[in-house]
């Protein structure tokens, strides 16, 4: 099982935890794919982008995301860590100026145009097996995780720790 | 104040078993990551295993598969080291380690005082 | 996997001197690496994560660089209690420390 344990233990915490700097820590390229290899594509249409969730036909070349890692701190009474109570936040661009959001009325997964500070729609919790494996957790909507659903990308909410194996919000990172 | 406290080292002879234990404090235990290192007389540091936050995904260094198993007990925040068939090559200081963040793999932000294990007929 | 090689093995420097330790991946880590120090008789402690980030409470005269697969630890002004062996270790896949730099006073 892919796991984080008590989803629900944590989740009052990511509502008032707060970004420890304006910078991010590091900054990574890397394209994205689904557990079961789809690659995470994005097109643009009609001036928007677009989402898609694809097999990529031999030698076709993938999408990239930057990703930016952010710490953020726990607030001090929930995590019982103080100082050492960290976590590590996302954001993802595809391209310049364009940022993954939540829609959480819609639970959707959006590209939208925006300038910094970003705002919390576009923060995900990073919870990972390694560096190429990994889930991202709305910041605005603990227990909420991007999922895959009909070949798009998805809000899946996520209500016990259990249910964290599901491989529909599980993603690979890779460089190439 | 985070502390852990890793028991259980000794010496023991080849082909035995032993098993390690670290008991954690001063944080939440469940949130994080947990790992055991190991550092051979006047040698460097080896990763040994890891274990994420509710013990579904355990990772091992090849020369320990099928002979050490990683668990823990977040009831008890508490993580063992199950080492079985032991071999010479296995003498050394076994190190507990925590997660540098919640929820994530990476980094390991804060270190047992380690506890020694000889393996010797 | 990938190796991680730390050079030198040994570095021998007089207090206040700017000290360079270098450690090179067998393949991008994507600055996914840090750095740690162990004491004679101590565990090791964590001074530098993701490359670049300063661990809280560690002295700014250590300093970490790089990217792909060359990256380095600085100590602007050596000071006597920096007196350890250092050792890199890359998280980008899997889990890998490298053999470490011991630093010493001249």
């Known amino acids: 099982a892919f796991g984080i344990s008590g989803v629900q233990k944590y989740t009052r915490a990511l509502h008032d935890s707060s970004i420890t700097g304006i910078s991010p820590i590091t900054e990574y390229l890397a394209s994205l794919s689904t557990y079961n290899d789809q690659s995470i594509t994005f097109a643009l249409e009609d001036e928007s982008y677009e989402i898609y969730v694809e097999d990529l036909k031999k030698d076709e070349k993938k999408d990239k995301v930057l990703l930016s890692y952010y710490e953020s701190q726990h607030p001090s009474n929930e995590s019982g860590d103080g100082v050492d109570g960290k976590m590590l936040m996302v954001t993802l661009s595809p391209t310049k100026d364009f940022w993954l959001h939540a829609n959480n009325k819609e639970h959707s997964v959006e590209l939208h145009k925006c300038e910094k500070p970003l705002p919390d729609q576009a923060f995900f919790v990073l919870h990972n097996m390694h560096s190429n494996c990994v889930s991202f957790e709305c910041k605005t909507d603990p227990g909420v995780f991007i999922g895959v659903k009909d070949n798009h990308l998805a809000l899946i909410k996520v209500d016990s720790s259990e249910n964290l194996c599901t491989e529909n919000i599980l993603f690979k990172l890779s460089e190439t | 104040e985070v502390q852990l406290v890793e028991t259980g080292g000794g010496l023991v002879q080849p082909g035995r078993s032993l098993k390690l234990s670290c008991v954690a404090s001063?944080?939440?235990?469940?949130?994080?990551?947990m790992y055991w290192i190991r550092q051979a007389p006047g040698m460097g540091l080896e990763w040994v295993s890891s274990i994420n936050n509710d013990g579904g995904n355990t990772y091992y260094l090849d020369s320990v598969k099928g002979r050490f198993t990683i668990s823990r007990n977040n009831a008890e925040n508490t993580v063992y080291l199950q080492m079985n068939s032991l071999r010479s090559e296995d003498t050394a200081t076994y190190y507990c380690?925590?997660?540098?963040?919640?929820?994530?793999?990476?980094?390991?932000?804060?270190w047992g005082q380690g506890t020694l294990v000889t393996v010797s007929s | 996997d990938i190796q991680m090689t730390q050079s030198p093995s040994v570095l021998s420097a007089s207090v206040g001197d700017r000290v360079t330790l270098s450690c090179k991946a067998s393949h991008n880590i994507n600055k996914h690496l840090d750095w740690y120090q162990q004491k004679v008789g101590e565990a090791p402690k964590l001074l530098i994560y993701f490359t670049n980030n300063l661990q809280t409470g560690i002295p700014s005269r250590f300093s970490g660089s790089g990217s792909g697969t060359d990256y380095t630890l600085t100590i602007s002004s050596l000071q006597p209690e920096d007196v350890a062996t250092y050792f890199c270790f890359q998280y980008n896949s899997g889990w890998t420390f490298g053999q470490g730099t011991k630093v010493e006073i001249k």
């Open positions: 001063g944080f939440t235990f469940s949130n994080y990551w």
């Open positions: 380690a925590k997660g540098h963040y919640s929820y994530s793999s990476y980094s390991f932000g804060y």
